[in-house]
């Protein structure tokens, strides 16, 4: 049965397909496996119809292959029971997983330290610009623009928390109404969603692991998405999160409080301090107006300074002019007053490896961009085969059951609420929702965690990330307090509001449906991935923007006809889904469109096309690069540099995806041996896909 | 080190006039204001005016006001002091001091030039 | 002008003795009070500024307090170096004006 069987066998027309939404393989076994699976008609249903790539409900496709792609891996044990090893083999054993576990908090520490300086590079690269986007006043009052600012200002400095205090900070100020504030809240929302998106793309080796770890981490995005497709019209004409944030603050009378504690900062900070040290004072400052801040660097050069409230002396006409007779002398020539000036004196250097270098923000930007996502990936795939060699047999059983089981009937509903508390619980202990869905993401890929349970921890993440904030602003000066407290209980209100559109029916679980439906076309084509990350938080932010600065009658002109194109496919969608018979013939399928209108194909083949041209240039370096890793690593059976190979044999092998298999001699004995004697089989290596299909892009 | 070095010792006829000068070294001289003070035989201080090399600014007591000029020569760090229509009581050792430009305090004196004012 | 006087105008002590010298302005001059060493033949030093700044250089033994109109020049212990007369100097109102001096004697 298909997960979703009001869906099942719904095809309109199933005799018109093009290629499956995936390849054959899967991670279930053999002999699990239906020869071939046929729909009522009696017809075979190996392909899958492939719909335009602006419906959404395209993402909602059933996958009609004999295996469901989404089902978990099964991770076998390839190891010697504990029972038929030797003392000697049992004190290895155990050394070895005590080994496997340091390195796993080892690659796990490095994880998080690579986010925190990721969103330090993406602010030293896009800081700056994403404080502009706030210095404009008047687009800020279109909930619209407000919306994708929040957004953009986000996805650039990778940190929802600092686009917050930069719109506290407004607000505080004046220089910005609650009402204004609340649509990029809304889009701070979606722009903090990015981070595990990135990090899934380094999952995109293997194409049923991407497939789940997209998913797991699009999710986010799709909730969010809905969320303000559904809040933001309602907030704009009932103004209800306002309304209901001044009740709350009105009823309860807040009092200054402690902030929320920084468990992992405390951990994560001593190194990340030791790479770079921004002042995000700065990014405030331009949001705010301040000219003389476009000029300061983000880099932060001093770390210990001293603030002196220094009497300042000047010189005035006559005595009469001074501040007070106490503070009032002539140094012979001239009567001087003193004015009480606060001077910032610096003490101290701070210690990171940028500290004396003179490069502009823009160039540390990239450097650190860079090193940050070659560590990201590195630590990403080291923890998934770590996670791959712990998890197996018996442990992994008991994991998957823990974590992905419901409670017995008929209290299986609480579930999910228990799912949404601890996703809630753990980001406010790691201070960060993109820590926590980006740590978790890994682990849907490899199949730890289904999707259907990631989608409730992700959820309890966002409520984390606002409970978090409100401490912080229960915690802030009485000038700010107000206005952080209530901006901080508007992104509260925002996600209780979504998770209660989205969550509590199954049947409006939509954000599983569509990032599934994500999953299934980006595990065919990883170059959609891509595409969707830059077109979802760059290209429609950035457009919507560019509108909004044209003003309401430019955006309303150019909106209103997509919106409403896009409500006609959907509907049409809808129609051919349920009930094709009331449509005339022609419109019971896509195929009058163009081709490229309603597939993927042809764009794949112009993207293949143009990869093609740059991997033939670099191929001899790739090959050289492969060989040198295979050497190192050990490993017998590598597959190096296909972009070597002829057309034919790629597709082909883009079809099949064969895992790649390794002898014992490749495997790290602190890795994926799992405590097995030198030499005995070969071990499946989940990650190793992950190397070899590094020119997925 | 910082040195403020006087002409020499003078001997002057009532009424005629006398000008003594002021040699500093070892600082900046434009950051700081010079005073005059001069010590009649037997008694106090007492403050006769300054000037700001950096600008020229002055400023003289009121009971020296039309009898004093002070001027500086920033090329050789120099400055002058000329009293004028001399009386028998303006016999004194009169000194030439360096103050910070906002302070009222002088942290280094010359050695004093003797001016004697007898017929 | 204000007027600043001095007093003792004269004061015999030995070596190791404390010494207190007053000095009384005709006004309030708001702490904004300094205090000269004048030795025969030698130049004049600033010994403390605003009432009780110490300059640099001037050895810790010598201290001042007071404010409104009446100040104060203490040495805790008297040293040989010390014997010199003693001059207070106000710079809150043009022009600057100084005591008669306080000449601190051997005795």
């Known amino acids: 049965m298909a997960p979703w069987p009001e869906l099942e066998n719904a095809q309109p027309n199933p005799g018109k397909f093009i290629e499956g939404a995936s390849g054959p393989q899967s991670s279930i076994p053999a002999k699990d496996k239906e020869a071939s699976k046929t729909n009522d008609n009696g017809t075979p249903v190996a392909k899958t119809e492939l719909l335009p790539s602006y419906s959404a409900l395209v993402l909602i496709e059933e996958h009609p292959e004999g295996t469901d792609p989404w089902d978990l891996p099964e991770l076998q044990d390839t190891g010697i029971k504990w029972s038929e090893r030797d003392t000697k083999g049992k004190t290895l054993c155990i050394f070895q997983g005590v080994g496997k576990f340091i390195l796993l908090l080892g690659f796990l520490y490095l994880f998080v330290c690579s986010l925190d300086v990721l969103s330090s590079a993406f602010q030293l690269v896009g800081g700056k610009v994403a404080g502009q986007f706030f210095s404009n006043n008047s687009i800020m009052s279109n909930p619209v623009a407000g919306l994708v600012i929040g957004v953009l200002v986000t996805v650039m400095v990778q940190s929802s928390s600092t686009s917050s205090s930069i719109i506290v900070s407004m607000v505080a100020s004046s220089l910005l109404t609650v009402r204004a504030a609340i649509p990029i809240i809304m889009g701070a929302n979606i722009g903090t969603s990015i981070t595990n998106t990135i990090v899934a793309l380094m999952q995109a080796g293997d194409r049923n692991e991407f497939r789940r770890a997209f998913a797991g981490a699009t999710v986010h995005d799709f909730f969010n998405w809905l969320s303000v497709f559904v809040l933001l019209p309602l907030e704009a004409a009932t103004h209800y999160l306002e309304i209901l944030t001044n009740l709350v603050l009105e009823t309860f009378k807040f009092q200054n409080g402690e902030d929320a504690p920084d468990i992992l900062k405390v951990i994560t900070d001593p190194f990340t301090k030791l790479i770079i040290q921004l002042d995000k004072k700065v990014i405030q400052q331009i949001a705010m107006g301040d000219s003389a801040a476009q000029n300061k660097s983000l880099i932060k050069i001093w770390c210990k300074s001293i603030t002196n409230v220094t009497e300042m002396n000047v010189t005035v006409p006559s005595t009469d002019n001074c501040t007070s007779p106490s503070y009032c002398w002539t140094d012979g020539i001239q009567t001087w007053t003193i004015q009480n000036v606060t001077q910032k004196e610096n003490i101290a250097k701070c210690q990171h490896i940028f500290v004396n270098f003179s490069l502009p923000d823009l160039a540390v930007g990239i450097i650190l961009l860079t090193v940050s996502l070659v560590v990201l990936c590195g630590c990403l795939i080291m923890i998934v085969k770590l996670l791959g060699s712990v998890l197996r047999g018996q442990v992994a059983t008991v994991i998957k059951k823990t974590l992905n089981t419901d409670f017995p009937f008929p209290f299986a509903w609480l579930t999910g609420y228990l799912a949404i508390l601890v996703g809630a619980g753990m980001t406010f202990i790691v201070q960060s929702s993109s820590v926590f869905t980006s740590a978790m993401t890994p682990l849907i890929g490899i199949g730890v965690i289904s999707i259907e349970r990631a989608y409730p921890l992700t959820l309890g993440s966002n409520i984390g990330t606002t409970t978090t904030a409100i401490l912080a602003a229960l915690a802030s000066p009485g000038n700010t307090l107000r206005s952080s407290l209530q901006i901080a209980l508007c992104h509260f209100f925002f996600n209780i509001s979504g998770i209660l559109l989205w969550y509590p029916i199954p049947f409006t679980r939509l954000p599983i449906r569509l990032a599934k439906g994500l999953g299934n076309i980006s595990a065919k084509y990883r170059w959609f991935a891509v595409f969707y990350l830059i077109f979802f938080f760059f290209v429609t932010p950035l457009t919507v923007f560019g509108l909004s600065l044209a003003g309401w009658p430019v955006l309303v002109g150019v909106g209103v006809p997509i919106i409403l194109l896009l409500l006609l496919v959907l509907c049409l969608r809808m129609l051919q889904f349920r009930c094709p018979r009331i449509l005339p013939l022609k419109l019971r399928d896509w195929n009058f469109l163009p081709l490229w209108m309603h597939s993927l194909k042809p764009w794949d083949n112009v993207i293949s096309l143009a990869t093609t041209c740059f991997q033939r240039r670099c191929c001899c370096c790739c090959r050289v690069c492969c060989r040198v890793c295979c050497m190192v690593c050990g490993c017998k059976c590598c597959r190096c540099s296909k972009c070597c190979r002829d057309q034919g044999e790629e597709e082909e092998e883009k079809e099949q995806d064969i895992p790649v298999k390794a002898s014992g001699a490749f495997d790290n004995a602190a890795m994926s041996k799992e405590c097995q004697d030198e030499g005995k089989g070969q071990v499946e290596v989940l990650s190793m896909k992950a190397l070899s299909n590094t020119t997925v892009f | 080190q910082v040195q403020l070095v006087q002409s020499g010792a003078e001997v002057k006829k009532p009424g005629a006039s006398v000008k003594v000068s002021c040699k500093a070294s070892?600082?900046?001289?434009?950051?700081?204001?010079v005073h005059w003070v001069r010590q009649a035989p037997g008694q106090g201080l007492e403050w006769m005016g300054a000037?700001?090399?950096?600008?020229?600014?002055?400023s003289y007591a009121q009971k020296f006001q039309g009898r004093v000029t002070m001027t500086r020569d920033t090329s050789t760090s120099t400055v002058y002091m000329e009293l004028s229509s001399l009386r028998s009581e303006d016999t004194a050792v009169y000194y030439c001091?360096?103050?910070?430009?906002?302070?009222?305090?002088?942290?280094?004196w010359g050695q004093g030039t003797l001016v004697t004012v007898s017929s | 002008d204000v007027q600043m006087t001095q007093s003792p105008s004269s004061l015999s002590a030995s070596v190791g003795d404390r010494v207190t010298i007053t000095c009384r302005a005709s006004?309030?001059?708001?702490?904004?009070l300094n205090w000269y060493q004048q030795k025969p033949g030698k130049a004049v030093k600033l010994l403390i500024y605003?009432?009780?700044r110490l300059q640099s250089g001037v050895p810790s033994r010598f201290s001042g307090s007071g404010s409104g109109t009446d100040y104060t020049l203490t040495i805790s212990s008297l040293q040989p170096e010390d014997f010199a007369t003693y001059y207070c100097?106000?710079?809150?109102?043009?022009?600057?004006?100084f005591g008669q001096g306080t000449k601190l004697e051997i005795k």
């Open positions: 000037i700001s090399p950096g600008n020229g600014d002055l």
């Open positions: 100097q106000q710079y809150n109102i043009f022009p600057w004006t």
């Open positions: 006004q309030d001059v708001y702490s904004y």
């Open positions: 070892g600082f900046t001289f434009t950051s700081y204001n």
């Open positions: 001091a360096r103050g910070r430009t906002g302070m009222g305090a002088v942290d280094y």
């Open positions: 605003y009432t009780s």
